[in-house]
């Protein structure tokens, strides 16, 4: 039997994550709820102990006996000012036992007190069990990560927690080091490199500067804010909506713990949505005194609510650079870690600070630390596989690579099995009038709709000058080099403004087995995919044509060339179609096509009449062939035929 694998555990303040290196790649392991991160929560009830999602899910009902933030206590003395300050904010009780803090809870009808190591060991046990369920055999060896600033006492206490959990802790490694390992920054072979790790998690913010030389990691500086993270952004949203509820319903929900907890959960979900969409909806039934709270928030408003918090992330960056005696130009690599680094504004602030430098973000930021810990665990277990020593080199693209166009359609630029290196360019355009930006979402897979494919990364190209839909020309280039590293660049041809993303192979991507499965599935689903693709295409063709016609007859240049009666006829029919579309987004292909033909029957004779004898062809873009592909509420991009 093959040697049992060692696991890598990111033991986080609010969430934890476990990974394993096997079959030549890192697998981040999902828990029994299908989540790849697990809340670092332990709850005690009258009947049982709950860990992870189950614990977090009942926190509103049982706040005094639901313990989280053990990482803020571990290895610290009770009298530590950090402990004394944090205690004020926790709903559970912390007691003093010989200057060691203990958490006191009611469990199965009795009062119990647990050391932070014990609470952390329970979370580690959960992570161990998650790995065992996946691997199918007992796991004992593990690498556990800690913040770079953890002192020896905190490190030792974390190791003890591992031992209590029945783990053989191979090594305690720094979280930023793990993230750097995840990106293979120790294997670039380019001499000494300065790496800045920007780790914005659920409850903490850590900036670390490492120097990597010949596989040796040295922490040059750390900075941060132990009380800045996703939860603070949630709080801003909660406060915003509490005020909105007051305005709308003249009621204050802030003292109702259950209502606030439900609102917080919805806010957290909305916050996540706003990282990929420009708008998010909240729908909470019977939030307070039977009142349903249905509302929404835009990304811009969210950014405004959190602007000071987002901007404050740059202060520790500057401090770390000062402490490391480095100029920002001397940083070779920027690595994003922690779920909150998905927030586009946070990324933009950091990227702008470093004058547009690319960010290493191709690995899921929630998972980068566990990913690196898993690689380190494999190395410490003596895994000699080439992949652990070096990245896989690809000679073909195993899956088609493309981007999402209007309607959630997968528009492939690089087809499956294209030999690499390869480079493909295509022109796209905007979906709405005066659209200020486009969201480029990069996917791999063979399915017609992006929701059925694998999201590799996304970025926004903003600053598009106001123009009617369909006018701007966005040149998108997919460029894969010999190492399988994909660079996607989007350029607004009118301004030359560009943005890009780099996606490295084999990181958060799919395994050979998954690729094979996806290809087989794609065959199976081909027919229904085609129906869906055609349906969306027909919808977009109709929508595009209707808007084009509307703007054509409203064009000031046509004054006097078109009768008011004809203009009204076109506008009335366009209005009919656009309204019908809004109400029938899920109509069948035949219905969309029928409406388009109806609209064309009205518009074509009128429009063509305008151009007869004008010595030129009809107006460009008025054909029936509309865009191929829009789903989300973010800025949408459309394919140009």
């Amino acid at each position: 039997m093959a040697k049992a694998a060692a696991i890598g555990i990111d033991l986080g303040t609010t969430y934890s994550c476990v990974g394993v290196f096997q079959h030549g790649k890192v697998e981040i392991i999902a828990n029994d709820q299908g989540n790849r991160t697990t809340p670092s929560y332990v709850a005690f009830t009258d009947t049982e102990r709950l860990i992870g999602d189950a614990a977090k899910n009942q926190v509103a009902l049982n706040p005094q006996n639901t313990v989280f933030d053990a990482k803020r206590l571990i290895g610290r003395k009770f009298g530590d000012p950090v402990v004394q300050s944090d205690m004020k904010h926790w709903p559970f009780q912390v007691i003093n036992d010989g200057d060691k803090p203990k958490v006191q809870v009611s469990y199965k009808g009795e009062t119990k007190a647990f050391y932070p190591e014990e609470i952390s060991s329970m979370v580690l046990t959960k992570m161990k069990e998650i790995a065992e369920a996946y691997l199918g055999y007992p796991v004992t060896n593990a690498v556990i990560t800690v913040p770079a600033y953890f002192n020896d006492s905190q490190r030792q206490a974390t190791k003890d927690a591992g031992v209590i959990a029945g783990l053989n802790v191979l090594r305690i490694i720094n979280e930023p080091t793990a993230a750097a390992i995840a990106y293979g920054l120790d294997r670039t072979g380019k001499g000494e490199r300065n790496v800045l790790i920007f780790d914005l998690g659920g409850g903490t913010f850590d900036v670390s500067i490492l120097t990597i030389d010949d596989g040796i990691f040295e922490v040059k500086a750390t900075a941060g804010d132990t009380h800045l993270g996703g939860e603070d952004f949630d709080n801003r949203l909660v406060n915003h909506f509490v005020e909105e509820f007051k305005r709308k319903h003249k009621k204050d929900i802030s003292q109702n713990k259950r209502a606030v907890r439900r609102l917080r959960t919805a806010c957290e979900r909305a916050k996540r949505t706003l990282s990929s969409s420009t708008q998010a909806s909240l729908e909470i039934d019977s939030l307070f005194e039977g009142i349903d709270f249905y509302t929404s928030i835009t990304r811009a408003r969210f950014e405004e609510l959190c602007s000071d918090l987002f901007r404050s992330t740059l202060e520790p960056v500057e401090k770390a650079l000062r402490d490391a005696k480095l100029d920002k130009a001397q940083i070779h690599d920027l690595v994003l870690v922690g779920g909150s680094t998905r927030i586009p504004k946070v990324q933009k602030l950091l990227q702008d600070f470093f004058n547009g430098r690319d960010l290493n973000k191709s690995i899921n930021p929630d998972e980068a630390v566990a990913y690196g810990a898993a690689v380190q665990a494999a190395i410490l277990m003596g895994d000699k596989s080439e992949n652990v020593q070096d990245l896989l080199l690809l000679d073909v693209a195993p899956l088609s690579l493309g981007l999402e166009t209007a309607g959630g359609v997968m528009t492939a630029l690089i087809k499956r099995n294209s030999t690499i290196p390869t480079k493909q360019t295509q022109i796209f355009t905007t979906y709405s009038d005066n659209q200020p930006g486009v969201l480029i979402q990069v996917y791999e897979g063979e399915r017609a709709m992006t929701k059925d494919n694998n999201l590799l990364g996304r970025f926004e190209l903003s600053g598009i000058p106001p123009a009617p839909r369909g006018v701007p020309q966005i040149e998108v280039t997919f460029d894969i080099d010999a190492n399988g590293i994909l660079n996607v660049t989007a350029t607004d041809k009118s301004t030359g403004k560009a943005n890009k993303i780099t996606i490295t192979n084999d990181k958060g991507r799919l395994s050979k087995e998954e690729i094979e499965r996806m290809v087989q599935e794609a065959e199976k689903y081909k027919a229904e995919d085609e129906v869906q693709r055609e349906r969306v295409s027909a919808k977009n063709a109709l929508e595009s044509y209707a808007f084009n016609m509307k703007s054509a007859v409203e064009d000031e240049g046509l004054k006097g060339k078109i009768s008011e009666a004809d203009k009204k006829k076109v506008l009335d029919k366009c209005q009919e179609v656009i309204s019908w579309l809004d109400a029938n987004t899920l109509a069948e292909k035949d219905e969309f096509e029928h409406k388009r033909k109806e609209l064309e029957q009205v518009c074509n004779p009128i429009i063509s009449g305008l151009y007869q004898g004008a010595g030129g062809p009809g107006p460009g873009g008025f054909g029936a062939q509309g865009p191929k592909g829009g789903s989300g509420s973010g800025p949408t991009i459309e394919e140009v035929d």
Epitope: D572, Q575, E576, I578, S579, W580, D582, A583, N584, A587, D590, E591, H594, K595, K597, E598, E600, Q601, N604, P605, A624
Partner: antibody, heavy 116, light 112 residues
């Protein structure tokens, strides 16, 4: 004056084919869509489909996809309905109808009988 | 596919009396942007082609006597013949054009 005149109906055996015509006059042919509607003996009206006379693109009701084909010759202001693999249940009077906000002008209809 | 159900199948009304025909749609025919319901009424006399009476629920086609009126919204529609004349004996059909086109089954109107 708007006029629509159908022709081409008659008796045909099951499995046979027939082409119906609808000649339009009194208006600009390509400005209005043209529909085909049929009525089986003693039954109600059933929409067969329509053709965009400007682009020539047809739309067929679900029951008529496959065996029926619409076309038009705008130089002759004429619409055609090609019916293949005819069945006894295709026996009906076939009308062409112009479409503006609704089917505002109708032909007199042409009778098709499918029988062995 | 939208299904239109007409009722009654037939009705006999005395000359000069009011005739009311109903048409129920399986889904709403109201376009909220144009505020129009896409329902039309046709009259077909024996041995003749159908004739358009009313479109957009209540707009009379030119030349149609004003004793014919249409009403309704959403899914429920009515054609009313205010004072039935002998020449109104016919089969009446409703037809939707909200999405594709479908006819109702028809209502036969006779003199009592």
């Amino acid at each position: 004056e708007v006029q629509l005149v159908e022709s081409g109906g008659g008796l045909v055996k099951p499995g046979g084919s027939l082409r119906l015509s609808c000649k339009a006059s009194g208006y600009t042919f390509t400005n209005y869509g043209m529909n085909w509607v049929r009525q089986a003996p003693g039954k109600g009206l059933k929409w067969v489909g329509w053709i965009n006379t400007y682009t020539g693109e047809p739309t067929y009701a679900d029951d008529f996809k496959g065996r029926f084909t619409f076309s038009r010759d705008d130089s002759k202001n004429t619409l055609y309905l090609q019916m293949n693999s005819l069945k006894t249940e295709d026996t009906a009077v076939y009308f062409c109808a112009r479409y503006d906000h609704a089917m505002d002008y109708w032909g007199q209809g042409t009778s098709v009988t499918v029988s062995s | 596919e939208i299904v239109l159900t007409q009722s009654p199948d037939s009705l006999a009304v005395s000359l000069g009396e009011r005739a009311t025909i109903n048409c129920k749609s399986s889904q709403s025919l109201l376009n909220s942007g144009t505020r129009k319901n896409y329902l039309a009424w046709y009259q077909q006399k024996a041995g003749q082609s159908p004739k358009l009476l009313i479109y957009w629920t209540s707009t009379r086609e030119s030349g149609v006597p004003d004793r014919f009126s249409g009403s309704g919204s959403g899914t429920d529609f009515t054609l009313t013949i205010d004072s039935l004349q002998a020449e109104d004996v016919a089969v009446y059909y409703c037809k939707q054009s909200y999405t594709l086109y479908t006819f109702g089954g028809g209502t036969k109107v006779e003199i009592k």
